[in-house]
Interface confidence: low
């Protein structure tokens, strides 16, 4: 999994949230929950949860085995939640297992979390 | 240092097939998405689609059905394009690139004349 | 499919100029969008991804914004290097899309 993460760190310059935090005191980025790991069965429903918060709200991406997760129409989606955002998958095949990564951006820091969908 | 390789430019007949290779290095192949770019002649750019090394699944741009194949060498960590009846219209420059297109081969210029 | 459309198609300017380049998605892409140079001859080279992140190793000069439809590159102050062109592509959708690219040249 580490070669997961830093090739998709690659994505996500870290230059720029290396500045004091005495430029913005209020600005935070916390991962609150790490990802799930999913178990399911072929033409079911997946759902994969990135729970973060920051200030100013997050921006939050995904990936998949480092590639970006592209939205397939009704069947592939993410979407903003309250607590971040939720990749569902539909109809699920076996081509979809994978690790699954989200990247998380207030535009000075980043978290990311990731969760293995099998 | 990560690096795409592919081989040389062709030159093919009308009706011919052509195999362009995307030699891998400096990461680990498997786990990266890789994608397939044509660019014709004075033209933009147009995604082809992409094979995914791990488990050799391919995803299509469906304006390249059915002449177009993505295989791989993992043993060699490279990919390959092959076009078979080739038609003038496919005389392009064709790139592999990495998952997160920040890593590009230097392109394969294929003409198909006869 | 998602079309990009960008304007202008071509561009003179000269070294020192703000240049800016639109790239207009016919659907929501969110921020899922990479601005690309080419230079003749060479394969396409990752300025911008995610819209507004500047990717590893290029200059602070080049700059993006925007989300949903609607896209912008900027470049702050036109150097000799910067005379190329510049590509947007969305990957929120299959098949993934180019823009028709923008042509920068000198004045």
């Known amino acids: 999994q580490e070669t997961e993460l830093s090739v998709s760190a690659e994505l996500v310059p870290t230059s720029s949230w290396n500045i004091s935090s005495e430029l913005n005191k209020d600005s935070y980025l916390t991962l609150d929950e790490p990802m799930n790991n999913i178990t399911t069965s072929l033409g079911q429903t997946a759902e994969l949860h990135c729970k973060v918060s920051g200030n100013p709200p997050p921006t939050i991406r995904w990936f998949k085995n480092d590639a970006p997760v592209v939205q397939e129409p009704r069947r592939l989606s993410f979407r903003s939640t309250i607590y971040g955002s939720r990749l569902r998958i539909r109809n699920l095949d076996t081509t979809d297992t994978g690790y699954f990564q989200c990247v998380a951006t207030n535009g000075k820091e980043v978290v990311s979390s990731t969760g293995v969908l099998f | 240092q990560v690096q795409l390789v592919q081989s040389g430019s062709e030159l093919k007949k009308p009706g011919a097939s052509v195999k362009v290779s995307c030699k891998a290095s400096g990461y680990t192949l498997t786990t990266n998405y890789m994608h397939w770019v044509r660019q014709a002649p004075g033209q933009g750019l147009e995604w082809m689609g992409w094979?995914?090394?791990?488990?050799?699944?391919?995803k299509f741009n469906h304006k390249f059905d059915g002449r177009f194949v993505f295989s791989l060498d993992t043993s060699v960590s490279t990919a390959y394009l092959q076009i078979s009846s080739l038609k003038a219209e496919d005389t392009a420059v064709y790139y592999c690139?990495?998952?997160?297109?920040?890593?590009w081969g230097q392109g394969t210029l294929v003409t198909v004349s006869s | 499919d998602i079309q990009m459309t960008q304007s202008p198609s071509s561009l003179s300017a000269s070294v020192g100029d703000r240049v800016t380049i639109t790239c207009q998605a016919s659907q929501d892409i969110g921020n899922n969008l990479i601005w690309f140079q080419q230079k003749p001859g060479k394969a396409p080279k990752s300025l911008i991804y995610?819209?507004?992140s500047l990717a590893n190793g290029v200059p602070s000069r080049f700059s993006g914004s925007g989300s949903g439809t609607d896209f912008t590159l900027t470049i702050s102050s036109l150097q000799p290097e910067d005379f190329a062109t510049y590509y947007c592509?969305?990957?929120?959708?299959?098949?993934?899309?180019f823009g028709p690219g923008t042509k920068v040249d000198i004045k």
């Open positions: 592509l969305q990957y929120r959708e299959y098949p993934l899309t």
């Open positions: 995610f819209a507004t």
């Open positions: 690139a990495r998952s997160d297109f920040d890593y």
């Open positions: 094979i995914y090394p791990g488990n050799g699944n391919t």
